[in-house]
């Protein structure tokens, strides 16, 4: 019996369209595949960021696959191809492996590149993203943003920059039809006269970054004699009720501080009969339904009732 | 004719262990491709794991990943899921089933009739 | 991951009707689908692989149709035993393995 043997694909590379992390693997068939005519050949795909400890694996029956990667590293990628048993009348033969890499060539020196990157998505509309100048760069240094996701046809420039003396510093986004539950690509680049600046690559989801606007409209009602409800509405905007947690921070008489998170829009709070006085704020924060992470917004306008008694009527600020 | 007999389900806290088996017969196990699929109460299908007829290729979806660990014995024609760290959300009927034609997974044309995992305290 | 979605989620027919049920992936994945049919208590069956092959067994007034990344399922006289949940499911790339998130068909 001679054993059956199957040759890797050809023609294997990454291949990057300029989407600033979104590249494209892609590959040939493999060499005298003409003794398989009757069988659908399939190929397992291993890649990650060169430093990553685990491989992303994947099979497919197509001659290419896509995927998200960090710029600011290298690639490596692995393929081979698979004949399952059908293929080969009695075992699974696999190729050796054929294999590539590709980096960007690093220009400058890392301590050029843009410092402190962040950026908020705010209230789910807003997208800014601001920055620090690289370290010792000199004042004629100037950074330029290019961001990508799916859905545009390619990369594009920040047109509004956030300036201090003279340098970029931060970004204004206009509005970002369907940006949100997919990855969102940044390259801050720079150029000096004086020396090479080094490249920075940044890929997040904006729903996971997002602060909203606090609540609005606090109010007491008084449900009891030791029980007075806490409302409060969810602040004006996209973002659905469904989608916010809250915190709430309540002060008895100047002492007793409660704090607390809730996922509706009340709080009942047991009080006694010697209350004077009652204050709270409610901070607003998307929830795991609607992102993996997010950011607390500022604090609502405090809420205070002073008194000899709270009032059954709602107290309205 | 081919069968496929899951066992192994039951009640389980959160953070426990279970070890689902499948018994295969009616057909040459070694050849194929194996996966397990789970349908939570009232819900739809999802992939949980594959195995390759060899038992040398095997692959999860995210969510179990790191907790769940498919294997197979081919000379007792016997598929396993090994499911650790266990979660609320892992409550499920889970079903085995045989890949018709492919290396790791395919379309199922033979499935088990399915072992209910309850996890809860 | 390939997103498969399906359309209508609920359906009501009569006997003798003709049903189609749509699915949808988010990328092309050229005519590597399934379609199963579910009744409830009961495991799924397989009714179509590779978009339009019948599997052995299954009534002839089953068929499938479309590639890349449209594709339908068909019952052309739908029978009283016909009444259950459909899925269809994408093995071009994985993991993971994904499936739709089903097509209940009910008595009108």
């Known amino acids: 019996d001679t054993e059956i043997k199957v040759n890797p694909p050809q023609d294997f590379e990454i291949v990057d369209p300029g989407y600033l992390g979104y590249l494209y693997l892609q590959w040939q068939p493999p060499l005298s595949l003409d003794h398989f005519k009757e069988c659908t050949v399939e190929y397992e795909l291993k890649y990650r960021n060169i430093g990553s400890e685990t491989w992303k694996t994947i099979i497919t029956k197509n001659l290419h696959y896509k995927d998200g990667f960090d710029l600011n590293k290298g690639i490596e990628a692995k393929i081979h191809t698979l004949l399952p048993w059908q293929c080969t009348n009695g075992s699974e033969v696999q190729s050796s492996w054929a294999e590539t890499t590709y980096w960007i060539s690093p220009q400058g020196i890392p301590e050029t590149k843009v410092q402190d990157m962040d950026c908020v998505y705010y209230n789910w509309q807003y997208l800014l993203c601001s920055w620090k100048p690289g370290i010792g760069v000199l004042l004629d240094t100037n950074y330029n943003l290019f961001y990508w996701y799916e859905g545009l046809d390619h990369a594009l420039q920040c047109v509004d920059y956030i300036k201090a003396d003279g340098q970029n510093i931060g970004c204004r986004f206009p509005y970002l039809e369907a940006s949100d539950y997919k990855d969102f690509y940044i390259c801050v680049n720079g150029s000096s006269e004086n020396k090479p600046i080094r490249s920075s690559y940044f890929t997040f989801q904006l729903q996971n970054i997002v602060k909203p606007l606090p609540p609005v409209y606090l109010t007491f009602t008084r449900e009891s004699s030791c029980e007075i409800k806490l409302k409060w509405s969810i602040p004006l905007g996209p973002i659905p009720a469904r989608c916010f947690d809250y915190e709430i921070e309540i002060r008895e008489d100047d002492t007793t501080l409660v704090t607390a998170t809730v996922e509706n829009e009340t709080y009942t709070l047991k009080t006694t009969n010697e209350t004077r006085q009652l204050c709270f704020v409610v901070r607003s924060k998307v929830n795991i339904y609607c992102s993996d992470d997010g950011i607390w917004s500022e604090w609502s306008d405090k809420q205070c009732w002073e008194g000899e008694d709270l009032s059954k009527k709602t107290l309205l600020r | 004719e081919v069968q496929l007999l899951e066992s192994g389900g039951g009640l389980v806290q959160p953070g426990g262990s279970l070890r689902l088996s499948c018994a295969a017969s009616g057909f040459t196990f070694s050849s194929y491709a194996m996966s397990w699929v789970r349908q939570a109460p009232g819900k739809g299908l999802e992939w949980v794991s594959a195995?390759?007829?060899?038992?040398?290729?095997?692959y999860y979806a995210d969510s179990v990943k790191g907790r769940f660990t498919i294997s197979r014995d081919n000379s007792k024609n016997t598929l396993y899921l090994q499911m650790n760290s266990l979660r609320a959300e892992d409550t499920a009927v889970y079903y085995c089933a045989k890949v018709r034609y492919g290396w790791g997974a395919g379309a199922f044309d033979y499935w088990g009739q399915g072992t209910l995992v309850t996890v809860s305290s | 991951d390939i997103q498969m979605t399906q359309s209508p989620s609920t359906l009501s027919a009569s006997v003798g009707d003709r049903v189609t049920i749509t699915c949808r992936a988010s990328q092309s994945i050229s005519s590597w689908l399934a379609w199963y049919q579910q009744k409830p208590g009961k495991a799924p069956k397989l009714l179509i692989y590779d978009a339009s092959s019948l599997e052995s067994g299954v009534p002839s007034r089953f068929s499938g149709s479309g590639s890349g990344t449209e594709f339908t399922l068909t019952i052309s006289s739908l029978q009283p035993d016909d009444f259950a949940t459909y899925y269809c499911q994408q093995y071009d790339t994985y993991p993971p393995i994904t499936f739709g998130q089903g097509t209940k068909v009910e008595i009108k």
């Open positions: 195995i390759s007829g060899s038992g040398g290729s095997t």
